[in-house]
């Protein structure tokens, strides 16, 4: 991954300021969330490792009609190099847990940040 | 209330090694989100950052320094150090400890700072 | 490295009239949400003191005639109405990414 179409602006993006976007709506959503994040939706849990963020949309991609999360599918999208469609798990190897989507945004939160801290952007 | 504070020799010799100590309070490195940073300040000049630590062990330099610094934290006396290695009179200065202030726990903003411990390198 | 050029360098102001201090970095430093541009206040035998936060963000504490604007590569500072306390050298950060550097002070 060496660049990718940005959201909001007209040429490609860096891939240090795509996932400093993808960064700030997951802080966005965490720190506005009230009610449970898309009525306490589960999702199947993933390694937080190769082929995260096609494994974390195929995951999230699941999540119908919750706006909450629709900018992060989008976003998300932009960092996989496949068309995912809902049911679709081929990033997704093991698909034995599941979280609530609140949970998985939290935790894939915390290793983005670590990876953004750790200048590992690709 | 949160508070830092910087100490060091002083005075060294070029070619030495500097060991400087933050020692701070109202916070702990073991929260999540949360760092400590280096920034120099030559006399009468400009402000250089240097290193940080994050609360995860995660530690950032200043490329143009990065063979000379070494950062390390001791989380449970709430301190952080930094050592420059074979000192020369360009790093006279006054040695700054800060907190990261970060809303996103990333960035390096440096929300509170110590009040410095000066250095001279000389012969 | 991005390199932080403030202007003035150096800026003289009535009492009660407005200070504009300006920094402009040679790359942006914003997403389409944020800005990752902060700023510091030092007065003399002092630590600098964080003023502003992510552009335009005032740091707890702060007096609210500090305000800061701006994005991409093009920020201010502004100070009104200036009091005499307000006498300092003012520093512009980025923390975009490493390494984090400053303007060379107003």
């Known amino acids: 991954l060496t660049c990718l179409g940005g959201f909001a602006s007209p040429g490609p993006v860096p891939p240090s300021t795509a996932l400093r976007e993808l960064i700030e709506e997951l802080v966005n959503i965490t720190q506005n969330q009230k009610a449970p994040l898309c009525n306490g939706s589960m999702v199947w849990s993933i390694n937080l490792t190769a082929g995260m963020y096609c494994a974390a949309l195929e995951s999230l991609i699941n999540v119908s009609g919750c706006s909450a999360i629709e900018k992060t599918q989008r976003m998300l999208s932009g960092f996989c190099p496949h068309k995912v469609s809902a049911g679709q798990f081929s990033s997704l190897h093991v698909r034995d847990t599941k979280i609530e989507v609140a949970q998985f945004v939290k935790d894939l939160l915390l290793h983005l940040k670590k990876l953004f801290r750790e200048g590992q952007f690709n | 209330q949160v508070t830092l504070k910087e100490s060091g020799p002083g005075i060294l010799q070029p070619s030495q090694t500097l060991s400087l100590t933050c020692s701070f309070s109202?916070?702990?490195?073991?929260?999540?989100?949360?760092?400590v940073g280096w920034i120099r300040q030559p006399s009468g000049k400009g402000l250089e950052w240097l290193a940080h630590?994050?609360?995860?062990?995660?530690?950032r330099y200043n490329p143009a320094l990065k063979s000379r610094l070494t950062i390390s934290k001791d989380t449970s006396s709430s301190q952080v150090f930094l050592k420059i290695a074979s000192v020369d009179t360009a790093d006279t200065a006054t040695y700054y400890c800060?907190?990261?202030?970060?809303?996103?726990?990333?960035?390096?903003?440096?929300?509170?700072w110590g009040q410095g411990t000066t250095l001279t390198v000389s012969s | 490295d991005i390199v932080l050029t403030q202007s003035p360098a150096s800026l003289a102001v009535s009492l009660g009239q407005r200070a504009t201090i300006s920094c402009r970095a040679s790359?942006?430093?914003?997403?389409?949400?944020?800005?990752?541009m902060n700023w510091y206040q030092q007065t003399p035998g002092q630590p600098p003191k964080l003023l502003i936060k992510?552009?335009?963000n005032l740091e707890s504490g702060i007096p609210a005639r500090f305000s800061g604007s701006g994005s991409g590569t093009d920020f201010t500072l502004n100070i009104h109405p200036v009091e005499e306390e307000d006498t300092a050298t003012y520093y512009c950060?980025?923390?975009?990414?490493?390494?984090?550097?400053f303007g060379g002070g107003t």
């Open positions: 992510y552009a335009s």
């Open positions: 800060a907190r990261i202030g970060t809303n996103y726990g990333y960035d390096g903003l440096f929300d509170y």
């Open positions: 630590i994050w609360w995860d062990d995660v530690k």
């Open positions: 109202g916070f702990s490195l073991s929260t999540s989100d949360m760092g």
């Open positions: 950060q980025h923390s975009w990414e490493i390494p984090y550097t």
């Open positions: 790359q942006s430093v914003s997403t389409s949400s944020y800005s990752y």
